[in-house]
């Protein structure tokens, strides 16, 4: 059941990214580190880079509430079991600052792409009986 909930959370993050993509014009047009083509075993490290990025509402009024709520939900911390898996490869993964910086639209697209990759890997690892997902 925990595995199922984990998948639901990951898919939910994709939906949150999709919702934020509707409001790119209401986001601060700041360039943010946006991992792409993330090497194997560095997915969780890249994920944390996306979570740490200072994505912000431009406070233009109309959509400010849903944007702020969505951004905060994107930063929901995964459980320590995944943190432990990240830890194993942390020293060999690129730092957040080393990734190319992109405006919010591309940042969100790359975040979605990473989430899709992580979901695919998670499903593959379950199919092949691997624990390290």
């Amino acid at each position: 059941q925990g595995q199922d909930r984990h998948m639901i959370r990951m898919r939910q993050l994709i939906d949150i990214v999709d919702q934020l993509k509707n409001y790119v014009n209401d986001l601060v047009p700041e360039f943010l580190p946006a991992p792409e083509d993330v090497e194997t075993n560095c997915e969780w490290s890249a994920f944390s880079c996306f979570q740490k990025a200072q994505l912000k509402s431009a406070n233009t009024g109309n959509n400010e509430r849903i944007i702020n709520v969505s951004i905060k939900k994107l930063k929901r911390k995964p459980p320590s079991t995944n943190a432990g898996r990240r830890q194993k490869h942390r020293l060999t993964c690129p730092s957040c600052d080393s990734y190319e910086k992109k405006p919010p639209k591309e940042f969100l697209e790359r975040f979605k792409s990473l989430l899709q990759k992580m979901i695919h890997q998670h499903l593959s690892s379950r199919t092949h009986g691997s624990e390290d997902s």
């Epitope: 959370r9 949150i16 709520v69 905060k72």
Partner: antibody, heavy 126, light 106 residues
Framework: QVQLVESGGGVVQPGRSLRLSCAAS????????MHWVRQAPGKGLEWVAF????????YYADSVKGRFTISRDNSKNTLYLQMNSLRAEDTAVYYC???????????????????WGQGTTVTVSS | EIVLTQSPGTLSLSPGERATLSCRAS???????LAWYQQKPGQAPRLLIY???SRASGIPDRFSGSGSGTDFTLTISRLEPEDFAVYYC???????FGQGTKVEIK
């Protein structure tokens, strides 16, 4: 069982204050965001305010901003709504509702208000 | 801010008939962010559907939700006497409600 019980409603004059309470039981209160929603007589539902599970963020409808304050005491499993400068148009049944998206990664994941109280009536009249 | 417009305002049907309720958003809504509620007279609302199409706990399978983008639908396949009520759609995150659709007995 999971339950929310509102109290504190009543008849109050315009310009006066009132504090509503919502007692939660049957679930880990500190893991859920909480809402206040109201319904004027014969009207539809109007969202009023939301507070994050840990109280770190609060959001308000424009109609109550600057007059109403949402707060919570996780040690008492209680949600509050402090209503100041009350107006006739604040007359309504006030419901507290649990946000269905738990702060726990493996917890509930509903993007909706999944548990509601029975409501408490606030009448603002001179 | 997003506006949710529900139609029709009132739906007059007989038990056993199919009810189709519409909710139109003024801007695109991610399907995860769309919920439906049922409210009977003198009662608190009840969550029926979350994520546009997922039934909440304990909701019978005659209730179904669908749609994406700006157009969403709640369908009650065969109306039971207890289904006559007011139905509201809501966008999560802004927590805006539609004005409601009343399903009444014809």
């Amino acid at each position: 069982q999971v339950q929310l019980v509102e109290s504190g409603g009543g008849v109050v004059q315009p310009g006066r204050s009132l504090r509503l309470s919502c007692a939660a039981s049957g679930f880990t209160f500190s893991s859920y965001g909480m809402h206040w929603v109201r319904q004027a007589p014969g009207k539809g539902l109007e969202w009023v305010a939301f507070i994050w599970y840990d109280g770190s963020d609060k959001y308000y409808a424009d109609s109550v901003k600057g007059r109403f304050t949402i707060s919570r005491d996780n040690s008492k499993n209680t949600l509050y709504l402090q209503m100041n400068s009350l107006r006739a148009e604040d007359t309504a049944v006030y419901y507290c509702a649990r946000d269905g998206d738990s702060s726990d990664w493996y917890g509930d994941y509903y993007f909706g208000m999944d548990v509601w109280g029975q409501g408490t009536t606030v009448t603002v009249s001179s | 801010e997003i506006v949710l417009t529900q139609s029709p305002g009132t739906l007059s049907l007989s038990p056993g008939e199919r009810a189709t309720l519409s909710c139109r958003a003024s801007q695109s809504v991610s399907s995860s962010y769309l919920a439906w509620y049922q409210q009977k007279p003198g009662q608190a609302p009840r969550l029926l559907i979350y994520g546009a199409s997922s039934r909440a706990s304990g909701i019978p399978d005659r209730f179904s939700g669908s749609g994406s983008g700006t157009d969403f639908t709640l369908t009650i396949s065969r109306l039971e006497p207890e289904d006559f009520a007011v139905y509201y759609c809501q966008q999560y995150g802004s927590w805006t409600f539609g004005q409601g659709t009343k399903v009444e007995i014809k």
